[in-house]
Structure formats: structure tokens, C-alpha cells
Interface confidence: low
């Protein structure tokens, strides 16, 4: 069983909000990790979207629109990526990753968990 699990595909209508889920295996505690989200469009490498540890400890990638936001459900051991006002260019692969929370937050190298699995979020014209 992989350390991280994401559903293989999701779809939603343009203009709506979609929430992608990243579930951490039960022998790990999401409460001690930052959740990182990446977007990968066809022909491009993955790009950093955001990091979420808590409401008071999070960071957005430069120029990443606020339509992209992170959250966590510690009880369910899950991280979430919400994308509001879905646009055609949001059709992409989305990757989550867990990183050890560091005291210097974004300034320090991250330690990656073993595995990252993709979620494909596909927008469709209603």
C-alpha cells in the first residue's frame, strides 16, 4: 500500500469548485507534515502550487492564483487542494507530497515521503 493515495481522476464543470484529496497511510500522522501540491500540464514538468501545514503556516507558490488553496483534515489523515472557479487551463495532473515541517518553512530543504501518486483533475464544459 502506498504512503500517499489520490483518486485517479476527478471532473467538474467550468466555473465550479473542485476538491482533490490526498490520503496519508494510517501508520503516518498528517498532523506533523506539510502537504505540498504540484500541477503538471501536458508537456511541462510538475510545478509547485502551494504548501499547507496549518492556517497559520502555509505558503503559496509565486504567481499561483488564490483560486488554489490547501487544507487538512487531521482526523481523516487527509490533505486537500481546492480549486475554485475552474478554468480550462486547470485541466492537468495534480500531485501531492508530504514534507517534514521545518522551522524555517520554505527556506529549508524538504524531506520527501516515499511516494507520490497523481490525481487527474479534468474540467469539462457544462
Amino acid at each position: 500500500q502506498p504512503v500517499l493515495h489520490q483518486p485517479p481522476a476527478m471532473s467538474s464543470a467550468l466555473g465550479t469548485t473542485i476538491r482533490l484529496t490526498c490520503t496519508l497511510r494510517n501508520d503516518h500522522d498528517i498532523g506533523v507534515y506539510s502537504v505540498y501540491w504540484y500541477q503538471q500540464r501536458p508537456g511541462h514538468p510538475p510545478r509547485f502550487l502551494l504548501r499547507y501545514f496549518s492556517q497559520s503556516d502555509k505558503s503559496q507558490g509565486p504567481q499561483v492564483p488564490p483560486r488554489f488553496s490547501g487544507s487538512k483534515d487531521v482526523a481523516r489523515n487527509r490533505g486537500y487542494l481546492s480549486i475554485s472557479e475552474l478554468q480550462p487551463e486547470d485541466e492537468a495532473m495534480y500531485y501531492c507530497a508530504m514534507g517534514a515541517r521545518s522551522s524555517e518553512k520554505e527556506e529549508r530543504e524538504r524531506e520527501w515521503e516515499e511516494e507520490m501518486e497523481p490525481t487527474a483533475a479534468r474540467t469539462r464544459v457544462p
Epitope: G43, P45, P46, R47, E107, R110
Partner: antibody
Framework: QVQLVQSGAEVKKPGSSVKVSCKAS????????INWVRQAPGQGLEWMGG????????NYAQKFQGRVTITADKSTSTAYMELSSLRSEDTAVYYC??????????WGQGTLVTVSS | DIQMTQSPSSLSASVGDRVTITCRAS??????LAWFQQKPGKAPKSLIY???SLQSGVPSRFSGSGSGTDFTLTISSLQPEDFATYYC?????????FGGGTKVEIK
């Protein structure tokens, strides 16, 4: 404050190789891609390739495929571009640039590579 | 590869002039277009991303527009520090490609 500092100018013989470094500071190195762009004297900008540091995958322009290797050392937050089988047409300023989700915002100062016999 | 064609290749203008530079892609690139400014001996500087979004710290006299294949960079009132070469770049797909550049010179 994000900074990309490149290695110094190089003079190389035709047929040899050059390795240019690009040290990043002020940000999470593994969160971004590093692109390499070159500019021959009096010419425009030409993308050579890039590497996504966190994921390790590199992508190269067809023109340079087999001659260029882009790598990154996470422990020193440094990216490298090695170009082999140098010829006179490779004389150019080589830039590294950080890909910030949309496009390259932060650029190194440039490294002049001169290929001459 | 996607070809990016910029026009004009050079232009002469005076301080205060409105300047327009166009960039055409050989195929549709949505809004995945950036504009850069480069001065002699310096690295390029990002002005516009996503075709029309102004980079942080860039004066509002710079604006971008367009989608698909046709794009425009406009300088509403040319300032002395704006004399430089401007490049468009598509990042819709690899390989990333630049336009040939437009040199803005003093008339």
C-alpha cells in the same frame, strides 16, 4: 530575496565540454524548475532545456539533445548545465532562470562561454 | 515546435509615445505567453506572464493582451528607461520558444 548566482566566464577549445553552475538562494530550491537559456552575441534568446529540481526530470530542446546535460544538486541548491562537443557557434552568454509556476521570473547574471581554438 | 514571430524587429520612438509590439504563435497557445525586457549586458527581466498579468514591481504603463495566436505588448507612455529589446516567449509546450525580439530605440 531570491538570487541565482552563476559561475564565471570560460574560454574553451572546440570539441571540449563546459559545465556552468547556478547557485540558488532565498527560496525552496526543490519547489521549482531551473531553465537554461543562451544568447549568442547580437542574437536573441534560445531555450536549451530545464530541470524540475524536486522531481529530477530534465527536458531538452531537440537542437541540444545528446550534447547538453542539466542536473541539480539539492544539497547545495545548485543547478548545472554541461554542454559537450563545443563548436564556435556555441560562443554565447548562458543564463539560468527559475521557473515560477508561470514563467521565469528570476535570472542569473549570465556566464559568457567563448569557444575558440 | 511552436514558432513565435515578433514584429516589428525594431522601432524608433520618443519619450511619451505609445508603443505596441506584436507576437504571433504558429499555433494556439491559450494565454501561455510571457514578455521580457532586456537591456545590453543584462539578463532578461520578466514584465508580463499569462499574456496579460503584470509581474510584481513592473510599472503599470506596461500591459499585455491577446489569447490563442495573437498577442500584444503595449507601453502606454514610453519612458527613458524603457529603451531596450523586448521578447515574447510561449510556455504552452516544450520546447519553450522565444520571439526574435523587438529593439526599441530613441528617435
Amino acid at each position: 530575496q531570491v538570487q541565482l548566482v552563476q559561475s564565471g566566464a570560460e574560454v574553451k577549445k572546440p570539441g571540449s565540454s563546459v559545465k556552468v553552475s547556478c547557485k540558488a538562494s532565498g527560496g525552496t530550491f526543490t519547489a521549482y524548475a531551473i531553465n537554461w537559456v543562451r544568447q549568442a552575441p547580437g542574437q536573441g534568446l534560445e531555450w536549451m532545456g530545464g530541470i524540475n529540481v524536486g522531481f529530477g526530470g530534465a527536458n531538452y530542446a531537440q537542437k541540444f539533445q545528446g550534447r547538453v546535460t542539466i542536473t541539480a544538486d539539492k544539497s547545495t541548491s545548485t543547478a548545472y548545465m554541461e554542454l559537450s562537443s563545443l563548436r564556435s557557434e556555441d560562443t554565447a552568454v548562458y543564463y539560468c532562470a527559475r521557473d515560477d509556476y508561470w514563467t521565469s521570473v528570476y535570472w542569473g547574471q549570465g556566464t559568457l562561454v567563448t569557444v575558440s581554438s | 515546435d511552436i514558432q513565435m514571430t515578433q514584429s516589428p524587429s525594431s522601432l524608433s520612438a520618443s519619450v511619451g509615445d505609445r508603443v505596441t509590439i506584436t507576437c504571433r504563435a504558429s499555433q494556439g497557445i491559450s494565454n501561455y505567453l510571457a514578455w521580457f525586457q532586456q537591456k545590453p549586458g543584462k539578463a532578461p527581466k520578466s514584465l508580463i506572464y499569462a499574456a496579460s498579468s503584470l509581474q510584481s514591481g513592473v510599472p503599470s504603463r506596461f500591459s499585455g493582451s491577446g489569447s490563442g495566436t495573437d498577442f500584444t505588448l503595449t507601453i502606454s507612455s514610453l519612458q527613458p528607461e524603457d529603451f531596450a529589446t523586448y521578447y515574447c516567449q510561449q510556455y504552452n509546450s516544450y520546447p519553450l520558444t522565444f520571439g526574435g525580439g523587438t529593439k526599441v530605440e530613441i528617435k
